[in-house]
């Protein structure tokens, strides 16, 4: 039986040290390249094997990056976000939002007042 899918959203500060081949991940999103409907935020689309992010282990594909070295990523063009990462220096602090999928009980067994749909 299928359950209703909800999400648990948490935030984390991740400090990465730029490796020989960089930070080791890809991003999507921006005001000109929305990845999530009605959200121009910047999301991690790929973690490169053996890159700095993969070796650290905390950054995950699907994470939303809220800031880089304290600089907010809201309302940025995609390329401006890419350039911000590329110019972020050796020690890079990322504020990220993890979105964990949680199963919320089987459909058909909702409590009273629970929204249907």
């Amino acid at each position: 039986m299928n359950g209703r899918v909800d999400y648990l959203v948490t935030e984390e500060e991740i400090n990465l040290t730029r490796g020989p081949s960089g930070l080791g991940f890809n991003i999507v999103g921006g005001t000109d390249q929305q990845y999530v409907s009605n959200d121009s935020g910047i999301y991690v689309s790929r973690i490169k094997e053996n890159g700095a992010a993969a070796l650290d282990g905390r950054l995950q594909e699907g994470d939303k990056i809220l800031s880089v070295n304290g600089q907010d990523l809201k309302n940025l063009l995609h390329q401006d976000a890419v350039d911000l990462f590329r110019n972020a220096g050796y020690a890079v602090s990322l504020r990220v939002q993890h979105r964990l999928q949680v199963q919320n009980g089987p459909i058909g067994h909702r409590g009273e007042g629970d929204p249907s749909g």
Partner: nanobody, 127 residues
Framework: DVQLVESGGRLVQAGGSLRLSCAAS????????MGWFRRAPGKEREFTAH????????NYADSVKGRFTISRDNAKNTVYLQMNSLKPEDTAVYYC?????????????????????WGQGTQVTVS
Amino acid sequence: DVQLVESGGRLVQAGGSLRLSCAASGRTFTHLNMGWFRRAPGKEREFTAHINWSGGSTNYADSVKGRFTISRDNAKNTVYLQMNSLKPEDTAVYYCAATLGDSVDLDSDADPRGYDYWGQGTQVTVS
């Protein structure tokens, strides 16, 4: 997942032109960065060209600069490689590759490990 299908390869005379196409399906095309690689007989796979999601940024191997042009049509989910002034040393199987998003690292376009999705290839023979 992303499916990539190349077409357009054939036998052509030296000095001639070809246009290769790579049709993508399975994911929003505008989020994919695309590359062309080639493998000549008995050689390693070699980077040829790269284009970013918008088409605003392109990158070429020195061996094809000025002769090859990569482009994309996001409405048709297709990337192209226009090959002019072909030489016998351009003979190879040409592969289309894709990765989701832009790398935040410089100089990663030419690394095949940076791509997750690959086509089956199309043969180009220059006589």
